[in-house]
């Protein structure tokens, strides 16, 4: 689809006569018929088939055209076609005089043609004008045309549609040839797909509008080369999507059993060492002079009861002194200047003389001890509770309570952290002083065996005779296509020999 | 256990700002994207900003683009959203959430309110 | 943005009850699809996610089915503490997009 322009320029026709040589009365008024049609050897009369105008009376015998409306009429003068430009036409131009108003053929005498003239030829598509004059024996006819393509059609020959847009079908001008050209950030045969941030990932990203980077469910940053470990994920990264690697001093399917409670907490005070031993459970070794779980205790040097025979500890700068009860002395009261006539055993013992009555000794029931019966025994004394656990007095016995991850009377044995048997598929368990490691059986992996792999059972090269191997996914067994000739699980058999 | 706390909300009038904190704790927080999801009186849930764990790539619902802007302090565990030129309709719950917006929102803050009213 | 249709608005059911809530999206989201519950006052907690994937700590009697765009959260046997109001998610396409709700009130 197309127009093809021409521009009356300027006529001349000095004397003011028609074609047949008479003069116009009272000058010629001069109108012009046009007629454009397909390409003719000889330009004969017949239909218009490309199109025909006519104008407006322009002027009076000689007279240039304006290059706009003249009288209602427009310069260049249009004839639009719907069609495939063919690259050629024929085109005839006729002058007519016009006596009256009315300038329909029908309404005019034969003999008011002033001039005719019919040129035909190759014509391109182009923006520039090709001018031309045609001289007759009384008149001239300067004039210029061109064929243009309507909005929206491109090509040589006018037959490309294009338009441009914006939105969601496409983002593109029109080159002068009819090719899409995208707007900037766009990409595509109908410029329809963005152009993501540059270096924004293949796979893990994509745009719906240029320079955007939107990641695919399971990875994140600016270009979705980082992945998002697992949604109940506590103290792990990932290396793909939905992982859960434990950082160091962390356990557990979601990285949320602490197996470094001694850096994590500090539980140890006073200055004390810390030891991890297993799942959030630790070992204070204290400092001298301090005591407790978490060695929080600090210690008196009268608090180990050194001074006998009822004597009175009081703590001192340097240690600690006795104040011994009468008929005691010594450094612990440890010496008596008592008898048994002094009934000087407490708590039911009974006294026995000594050195002929110069000394005594006393024998003490159950739950009493000291030179004098006079202290309850404290089975707790000689901390006989392993890994920290705490002595409990019990009347004439005494109890553990031991700390989390440790068993036994005394607490001297490690509860296993395999006990609940946390390696899946098969997996072995091994307790380790940071925790438990898991051996997973071939086909798994993962900290405790959760992850199924799948198993090469190729790798042996199980089939005999050049068969394809296949593993099979769903029982991880090989299998052995075999070629012409042989047969068997592994092909081993050549055909006819039965096996043995 | 994991634990998102959210503070800064509060009656501002149109045109005003706003800061929200989350702090978090429980789990490490460098390595999560976390999100601001939000929730208007009567109304259902609207996703607002995520931003990425270790780069802090943000991302944001249209209606608060230029206007809201998602922040994080790995050192501190601490979410920030700065809200500027509020508007009636940002009134809302405003929930601190771990999780981007192509995955789950698996934790939750208690959330805290924010009331745009003259 | 993907609309997420979640069906009934509200329902009135009983202890022990079975109880399915639907989430329907306007175009495929695959599996990414997760489902909350919120109590009055309370904020959202992940029940399920991948469609079918139960969230650590929630109790069995909780599934999700689905695939394409329709998905489906099943309580199997109600208990009192199941009434609140549930949230379908997804999370293929940006922005993410929640559904409007489903009201679970006791009968």
């Known amino acids: 689809s197309g127009v093809f322009q021409l521009q009356l320029q300027e006529f001349v026709n000095e004397r003011g006569v028609l074609a047949s040589g008479r003069p116009c009365e009272p000058g010629c008024r001069t109108f012009f018929r046009v007629c454009l049609k397909h390409f003719q050897a000889v330009v004969s009369p017949g239909p218009c088939t490309f199109g025909s105008v006519s104008t407006p009376v322009l002027g009076t015998n000689s007279f240039a055209v304006r290059d706009d409306s003249s009288g209602g009429g427009r310069n260049p003068l249009q004839l639009p076609f719907n069609f495939t430009w063919p690259g050629t036409f024929s085109l005839i131009i006729e002058a007519w005089h016009a006596p009256g108003d009315d300038l329909r053929p029908e309404a005019l005498p034969p003999d008011a043609l002033i001039s005719k003239i019919a040129i035909q030829g190759s014509l391109a598509v182009g923006q520039n004008w090709l001018l031309d004059e045609q001289t007759s024996t009384l008149t001239r006819l300067r004039y210029s045309y061109r064929v243009i393509c309507s909005d929206n059609y491109y090509g040589d020959n006018c037959s490309r549609l294009c338009k441009k847009r914006n939105d969601h079908f496409g983002h593109y001008v029109c080159q002068p040839d009819g090719n899409l050209s995208c707007l900037p950030g766009w990409t595509g045969e109908y410029c329809q797909q963005p152009i993501c941030l540059s270096g924004c990932h293949e796979q893990n990203g994509y745009c719906s509008k240029p320079a955007e980077c939107l990641c695919r469910p399971g990875w994140q940053g600016r270009l979705c080369n980082e992945c998002i470990p697992h949604n109940g994920c506590r103290h792990g990264t990932c290396s793909t999507p939905w992982q859960c690697t434990c950082d160091e001093g962390w356990g557990g399917l979601f990285c949320d059993q602490d197996l470094n409670y001694c850096t994590h907490h500090s539980p140890c005070k006073n200055g004390a060492t810390c030891s991890n031993s297993g799942q959030r459970s630790y070992t204070c070794t204290c400092r001298p002079g301090y005591t407790g779980v978490d060695c929080e205790l600090e210690l008196s040097e009268c608090d180990s009861n050194p001074c006998r025979n009822g004597g009175s500890c009081k703590d001192q700068e340097d240690g600690y002194h006795c104040l011994c009860p009468p008929g005691y002395y010594g450094l612990h009261c440890e010496h008596s200047t008592l008898s048994c006539a002094d009934s000087p055993c407490f708590n039911g013992g009974s006294c026995r003389e000594r050195n002929q009555g110069a000394s005594y000794a006393c024998e003490c029931p159950p739950n009493f001890t000291g030179s004098n019966c006079e202290k309850k025994v404290d089975r707790c004394t000689s901390n006989p509770c392993a890994n920290g656990g705490q002595c409990l007095n019990r009347g004439p016995s005494r109890m553990c309570r031991c700390r989390p991850g440790f068993t036994g009377t005394y607490c001297e044995r490690h509860v296993s952290d395999c006990a609940r048997n946390p390696c899946a598929h098969g997996g072995t368990c091994h307790d380790l002083e940071s925790g438990l490691m898991c051996t997973c059986p071939a086909g798994f992996s993962g900290r405790r065996c959760e992850v199924r792999t799948s198993i090469d059972a190729c790798a042996s090269s199980p089939c005999f005779n050049r068969a394809t191997c296949y593993t099979d996914l769903s029982t991880d067994t090989f299998v052995c296509n075999c070629p012409y000739g042989f047969v068997g699980s592994r092909c081993e058999f050549p055909v006819g020999l039965p096996p043995s | 256990e994991v634990q998102l706390v959210e503070s800064g909300g509060g009656l501002v009038q149109p045109g005003g700002s706003l800061r929200l904190s989350c702090a978090a704790s429980?789990?490490?927080?460098?390595?999560?994207?976390m999100s601001w999801v939000r929730q208007a009186p009567g109304k259902g849930l609207e996703w607002v900003a995520s931003?990425?764990?270790?780069?802090?790539?943000?991302s944001y619902r249209d209606s608060v683009k230029g206007r809201f802007t998602i922040s994080r302090d790995n050192a501190k565990n601490s979410l920030y959203l700065q809200m500027n030129s509020l508007r009636a309709e940002d009134t809302a719950v405003y929930y601190c959430?771990?999780?981007?917006?192509?995955?789950?929102?698996?934790?939750w803050g208690q959330g805290t309110l924010v009331t745009v009213s003259s | 943005d993907i609309q997420m249709t979640q069906s009934p608005s509200s329902l009135s059911a009983s202890v022990g009850d079975r109880v399915t809530i639907t989430c329907r999206a306007s175009?495929?989201?695959?599996?990414?699809l997760a489902w909350y519950q919120q109590k009055p006052g309370k904020s959202p907690k992940l029940l399920i996610f991948?469609?079918?994937v139960l969230a650590d700590g929630v109790p069995s009697r909780f599934s999700g089915s689905g695939s394409g765009t329709d998905s489906t959260l099943t309580i199997s046997s109600l208990q009192p503490e199941d009434f609140a109001t549930y949230y379908c998610?997804?999370?293929?396409?940006?922005?993410?997009?929640f559904g409007q709700g489903t009201k679970l009130e006791i009968k």
């Open positions: 959430a771990r999780g981007y917006y192509n995955s789950p929102f698996a934790y």
């Open positions: 998610q997804q999370y293929t396409y940006y922005p993410p997009t």
């Open positions: 429980g789990f490490t927080f460098r390595y999560f994207p």
């Open positions: 175009q495929e989201i695959y599996r990414n």
């Open positions: 991948d469609t079918s």
């Open positions: 931003i990425s764990g270790s780069d802090g790539w943000a």
